[in-house]
């Protein structure tokens, strides 16, 4: 399903063969945090990959001496602000003492702000993107990804953390939002809906897509996730919408074909390394960008969100596999794992291309209500 204006060259138009496998923002592993309770220390828990809470699980940045070279991420609870009544609300619950946020769920009590006060912040994510109101910012150059092509060995950890499926990424995946804005990829996770119900986190003019992939990155200015949480630009997430297309997406199939092995909450498996960039759209030049937060507790703000204009196409069967295979807490299906959209509260979404220009013949002249605020750094 596309919005009326989503033609090949219009905002969010044209799915690519590049695939996205977004992992939720729920658990951001910290670099030095102690291992999760679900991850008892063992030979595989070598120094250098600790878990931090965040978007799904943010992996640690220090290289592990561990076999697969994968980083361990700690689950951060995601808390969500109230959204429209039809949408699932993200409320986290704690069944541990203290500030532990690694156990929370979508919907239910307590409200996320009680789990993490930041979830009630003014600049939260996700948001509804209105291309006509986006500020065209020519300083936003094409994204640069380096080292995202991984050989099959070492293998990577694919985990059902109870609120998403998350792939922990090894050291060396470098991403630049622009000059001097350099990041390292930590993990990726997905958000999805249920049968006949879309489950992307971001929306476009109110339109929700079937699913969404998030690739979570840590700024090279920080050694650990916990140091970056809440700092402007400390974390950056690349997000792409997943749509239904006629063909199977081979890149995503490498992950989706393994979901049955991790159907149970807390289970994990090892998957061969792959081209991580193939999970993303092929067009790195057209995107929307704004400053928001993690979409799961602790909902830390200062996160730079980059939402691709181009979508990624998966087959109907693949989308069904994604939404109908995993189980979450309390013997419930892991579905509708998205947070309701949050108010912009004065924020302006920037676009790397003139998204406000309607490409259809009906557009008399471009409508661009906001101007670019960024200087490009």
């Amino acid at each position: 399903q596309r919005l009326p204006r989503m033609q090949e060259d219009s905002p969010l138009g044209g799915g690519s063969s590049g695939e996205d496998d977004p992992l939720g923002e729920e658990d951001l592993p910290s670099e030095e945090d102690s291992p999760r309770e679900e991850d008892p220390p063992g030979e595989e828990d070598l120094p250098g990959e600790e878990d931090l809470p965040g978007e799904e699980d943010l992996p640690e940045v220090k290289p592990k001496s561990e076999e697969e070279g994968s980083l361990k991420l700690e689950d951060l609870p995601t808390v969500e602000a109230p959204g429209d009544p039809q949408e699932p609300q993200n409320n986290a619950h704690r069944d541990k003492e203290g500030d532990d946020q690694s156990h929370w769920r979508y919907g239910g009590d307590p409200p996320w702000p009680r789990v993490s006060p930041a979830c009630a912040g003014r600049f939260q994510s996700p948001v509804d993107i209105r291309p006509q109101l986006a500020a065209f910012c020519p300083a936003l150059r094409p994204l640069e990804l380096l080292g995202f092509q991984l050989p099959p060995l070492p293998e990577l950890r694919l985990r059902n953390n109870g609120h998403s499926v998350q792939l922990t990424l090894p050291p060396g995946l470098e991403m630049a939002l622009g000059p001097g804005r350099e990041y390292r990829a930590l993990q990726l996770h997905l958000h999805w809906g249920a049968a006949g119900r879309p489950g992307s986190e971001h929306t476009v003019e109110g339109h929700r897509f079937p699913a969404e992939i998030h690739v979570v990155h840590l700024s090279t200015a920080f050694a650990r996730v916990d140091e970056a949480l809440g700092r402007p630009g400390g974390l950056a997430v690349l997000a792409a919408f997943l749509e239904e297309g006629p063909e199977e997406n081979s890149a995503y199939e490498q992950l989706l074909s393994r979901l049955e092995e991790i159907a149970e909450e807390g289970s994990e498996t090892q998957v061969p390394g792959l081209d991580i960039s193939a999970l993303l759209p092929s067009d790195f030049s057209r995107y929307f960008q704004y400053e928001g937060s993690l979409t799961t507790p602790p909902c830390a703000q200062g996160v730079i969100w980059t939402v691709f204009n181009q979508t990624v196409m998966l087959s109907a069967k693949q989308l069904h596999t994604l939404s109908d295979t995993l189980w979450g807490p309390g013997d419930s299906r892991l579905q509708l794992n998205f947070r309701a959209t949050q108010p912009l509260n004065g924020r302006v979404i920037e676009a790397s291309f003139p998204a406000g220009v309607d490409s259809s013949p009906r557009a008399a002249e471009p409508v661009q209500l906001n101007s670019c605020l960024a200087a490009g750094d």
């Epitope: 030979e43 595989e44 070598l46 290289p63 592990k64 001496s65 561990e66 076999e67 697969e68 070279g69 380096l146 080292g147 995202f148 092509q149 991984l150 050989p151 099959p152 060995l153 070492p154 293998e155 090894p170 050291p171 060396g172 090892q270 061969p272 390394g273 081209d275 960039s277």
Partner: antibody, heavy 119, light 111 residues
Framework: QVQLVQSGGGVVQPGGSLRLSCAAS????????MSWVRQAPGKGLEWVSA????????YYADSVKGRFTISRDNSKNTLYLQMNSLRAEDTAVYYC????????????WGQGTMVTVSS | QSVLTQPPSVSGAPGQRITISCTGS?????????VHWYQQLPGTAPKLLIY???NRPSGVPDRFSGSKSGTSASLAITGLQAEDETDYFC???????????FGGGTKVTVL
């Protein structure tokens, strides 16, 4: 001390079989992918086979596919290479190597064992 | 013939800087796969010298550095020393072959 100690080399006739072993110590063997790499006399390095940390996935060079089998016993911290239908061109020093770290680099190597296929 | 191409030999005087090239294709180095470099002393196993294009394992002198661009990579040795006279190999992964691949090796001679 991190090390890989190899054994099992020797002289074998064409068509014969040989099994190489590689005993690991000083690191969590069961957490690492492993490979076999060979070097013919006076020649360069050639990757032969690889196996994932849990042994569930194996990979082979076209030159040995169907003849060689890589396996591991994580309870014994040992890697194996079963070589069947050996040919003269398989003559080489065989190294076991850890390729579970550094994004696919081989960071720990065994001392090597010579395999000579000759009639 | 090796998938990755290296010059058979490179020489330099003590203290000089030399570079060893490693040329691949769009299915290995050009596909954004990492390049790793090994040093092999006579009669011994190879030793990892540079991993992931430009990273040195602990214990490797900073005289050794790596770089990668397009379908090629290179190893630089500055302040060449007598003990650097040995063989060097580059390595990557090739998606077309589904195999880890090596260069043919380069013999470094210190004049």
């Amino acid at each position: 001390q991190v090390q890989l100690v190899q054994s099992g080399g020797g002289v074998v006739q064409p068509g014969g079989s040989l099994r190489l072993s590689c005993a690991a110590s000083g690191f969590p063997f069961s957490s690492y992918a492993m490979s076999w790499v060979r070097q013919a006399p006076g020649k360069g390095l050639e990757w032969v086979s690889a196996i994932s940390a849990n042994g569930g996935t194996t990979y082979y060079a076209d030159s040995v596919k169907g003849r060689f089998t890589i396996s591991r016993d994580n309870s014994k911290n040992t890697l194996y290479l079963q070589m069947n239908s050996l040919r003269a061109e398989d003559t080489a020093v065989y190294y076991c190597a850890n390729n579970g770290n550094y994004r696919g680099a081989f960071d720990i190597w065994g001392q090597g064992t010579m395999v000579t296929v000759s009639s | 013939q090796s998938v990755l191409t290296q010059p058979p030999s490179v020489s330099g005087a003590p203290g000089q800087r030399i570079t060893i090239s490693c040329t691949g294709s769009r299915s290995n180095i050009g596909a954004d796969y990492d390049v790793h470099w090994y040093q092999q002393l006579p009669g011994t196993a190879p030793k990892l010298l540079i991993y992931a294009n430009n990273n040195r394992p602990s214990g490797v002198p900073d005289r050794f550095s790596g770089s990668k661009s397009g379908t090629s990579a290179s190893l630089a040795i500055t302040g060449l020393q007598a003990e650097d006279e040995t063989d060097y190999f580059c390595q990557s992964y090739d998606s077309s072959l589904s195999a880890w691949v090596f260069g043919g090796g380069t013999k470094v001679t210190v004049l």
